[in-house]
C-alpha cells in the first residue's frame, strides 16, 4: 500500500523530521507549512489549523521559505555614489553597488555599504593595477623611457616617442619633443621589455620590466595635461 500522505499540520514520527518547506512548531508540536518568499506568517499553526501566510508590505521582503512574523525591511535608498542594481521587491532586498569610477571600500552581505572614488594617477605615474569592484587603483611611477601627462584612473605609462633628433628629452611626466622630422612610437606587439628610447634622460632606475605599461598596447599621440576638477579628490 502507498504510504499515507500527511497534510499539515501533522505530528511527526518519533525522532522524525518535517518535510521540505515545513517547520516544527514547538508550541503546537506539529509539522506546519512555511510561507513562500514574499510572504510571512500572519497566524502560526495550531494542532488543528495550518500556518496562515500574508504578503509582505511595501518596502519589506522575505527571500526564503519562512515562518517569520514580520517581513524584513529593505535597505535604505542607494546613496549618490551608488547605483541600484536590484530593486526592493516583496521577494528580494535592494542591492546597491558603486557607480563607474568608484569602488567598494566597505562591503556588506549583499552590495556595498561605502563607496570610494577610484584613485587618479597624477602626471609621472601610471595605472599599475586597475581598480576593481572592491579594490582601488594602484599608481606607480613611469619607468625610464615612458611617461604619463594625464590625471587618470585608467591611463598607463606610454613610451616616449623615438626621435631622429630630440628637441626636448622626455621625462616621466612629459613626452620627448622631436625636431621637425616625423617621430615613431615603437612598441612591438607582445614585447616584454620596453624599448630604450633614443636620447631620453633616464628618470630612475628600474630593475624589472615597467609595471605600468601593458605590452602590445596600441599607443596614441600624447594629449595635453588634464588635471581634475577643482576640489575633486583622488581617494
Amino acid at each position: 500500500l502507498p504510504a499515507q500522505v500527511a497534510f499539515t499540520p501533522y505530528a511527526p514520527e518519533p525522532g522524525g523530521t518535517c518535510r521540505l518547506r515545513e517547520y516544527y512548531d514547538q508550541t503546537a508540536q506539529m509539522c506546519c507549512s512555511k510561507c513562500p518568499p514574499g510572504q510571512h506568517a500572519k497566524v502560526f499553526c495550531t494542532k488543528t489549523s495550518d500556518t496562515v501566510c500574508d504578503s509582505c508590505e511595501d518596502s519589506t521582503y522575505t527571500q526564503l521559505w519562512n515562518w517569520v512574523p514580520e517581513c524584513l525591511s529593505c535597505g535604505s535608498r542607494c546613496s549618490s555614489d551608488q547605483v541600484e542594481t536590484q530593486a526592493c521587491t516583496r521577494e528580494q532586498n535592494r542591492i546597491c553597488t558603486c557607480r563607474p569610477g568608484w569602488y567598494c571600500a566597505l562591503s556588506k552581505q549583499e552590495g556595498c555599504r561605502l563607496c570610494a572614488q577610484l584613485r587618479k594617477c597624477r602626471p609621472g605615474f601610471g595605472v599599475a593595477r586597475p581598480g576593481t569592484e572592491t579594490s582601488d587603483v594602484v599608481c606607480k611611477p613611469c619607468a625610464p623611457g615612458t611617461f604619463s601627462n594625464t590625471t587618470s584612473s585608467t591611463d598607463i605609462c606610454r613610451p616616449h616617442q623615438i626621435c631622429h633628433v630630440v628637441a626636448i628629452p622626455g621625462n616621466a611626466s612629459m613626452d620627448a619633443v622631436c625636431t621637425s622630422t616625423s617621430p615613431t612610437r615603437s612598441m612591438a606587439p607582445g614585447a616584454v621589455h620596453l624599448p630604450q628610447p633614443v636620447s631620453t634622460r633616464s628618470q630612475h632606475t628600474q630593475p624589472t620590466p615597467a609595471p605600468s605599461t601593458a605590452p602590445g598596447t596600441s599607443f596614441l599621440l600624447p594629449v595635453g595635461p588634464s588635471p581634475p576638477a577643482e576640489g575633486s579628490t583622488g581617494d
Epitope: 597624477r122 602626471p123 611611477p141 616621466a172 630612475h204 628600474q206 583622488g234
Partner: antibody, heavy 119, light 106 residues
C-alpha cells in the same frame, strides 16, 4: 591605522656610513612608493628620493645621487636609506613619507631620525 | 628641475589676523601643490593638497588657491596653535619644497 615607525638616532664617524629604517604598517606596503626627506638643524625640507618597494626602482634628487641609497624589504614592510661617506653636512633629521601617486604625496610621515656626524 | 620660491621667510601676526604665504614655481605645475605645517621636533603634517583640497582634520580657517605658476596659502583667523613653519611642495615633476615660512605671534 597607518604608521611609519623609524629607527633610533644614529651617530656616525666622518667617512663612514649609516643605514636607517622605516617600518610601515596599516596599509599594503607595495601599493605606495616611499620618499625620504632631509631636514638640517634649523633649516627647511629637502627631498632626497623615492623607492618603489614592489619593484625596487628608485629616483633621486640630483644632489643626493652619490650620497643616498634607497632600498626596501617587502618581507618586513621596511624601507631603508643608507648614507655613505658621511660629513658634517649630513647631520640632519631624516624622514620617510609615503605617496600614493595621486593627489596626496606625503600623507603619512615617520617621526624622523636624527643622524649626527661627529669624530 | 622645478624650483619653488616661497615668501615671506618669516611672518609675525596677531591672534585673529589673516596671513598669506605665496609660492611661485619656475614653470606651470598644473595645481599640483601641497601645503604642510611643521611644529618644532615633529614631522610635517599635510594640510592642503592639489592647491585647495583640505585634508581631513584640517581646520576650515586654512585655505589654498592658485593656478599655473602662482599659488597662495592663507590662515584666515590665526590661533596660537598655528605657530609653526609652513612649506609648499610641488609634485608634478619629481618633488620640490619651498624654503619655508616661520609664523610667529606678536
Amino acid at each position: 591605522e597607518v604608521q611609519l615607525q623609524q629607527s633610533g638616532p644614529e651617530v656616525g664617524r666622518p667617512g663612514s656610513s649609516v643605514k636607517i629604517s622605516c617600518k610601515a604598517s596599516g596599509y599594503t606596503f607595495t601599493d605606495y612608493i616611499m620618499h625620504w626627506v632631509k631636514q638640517s638643524p634649523g633649516q627647511g625640507l629637502e627631498w632626497i628620493g623615492w623607492v618603489d618597494p614592489e619593484y625596487g626602482s628608485t629616483d633621486y634628487a640630483e644632489k643626493f645621487k652619490k650620497k643616498a641609497t634607497l632600498t626596501a624589504d617587502t618581507s618586513s614592510n621596511t624601507a631603508y636609506i643608507q648614507l655613505s661617506s658621511l660629513t658634517s653636512e649630513d647631520t640632519a633629521t631624516y624622514f620617510c613619507a609615503r605617496d600614493d601617486g595621486s593627489y596626496s604625496p606625503f600623507d603619512y610621515w615617520g617621526q624622523g631620525v636624527m643622524v649626527t656626524v661627529s669624530s | 628641475d622645478i624650483q619653488m620660491t616661497q615668501s615671506p621667510p618669516s611672518l609675525s601676526a596677531s591672534l585673529g589676523d589673516k596671513v598669506t604665504i605665496t609660492c611661485q614655481a619656475s614653470q606651470n605645475i598644473n595645481k599640483y601643490i601641497a601645503w604642510y605645517q611643521q611644529k618644532p621636533g615633529k614631522a610635517p603634517r599635510l594640510l592642503i593638497r592639489y592647491t585647495s583640497t583640505l585634508e581631513s582634520g584640517t581646520p576650515s580657517r586654512f585655505s589654498g588657491s592658485g593656478s599655473g605658476r602662482d599659488y597662495s596659502f592663507s590662515i584666515s583667523n590665526v590661533e596660537s596653535e598655528d605657530i609653526a613653519s609652513y612649506y609648499c611642495l610641488q609634485y608634478v615633476n619629481l618633488l620640490t619644497f619651498g624654503a619655508g615660512t616661520k609664523l610667529e605671534i606678536k
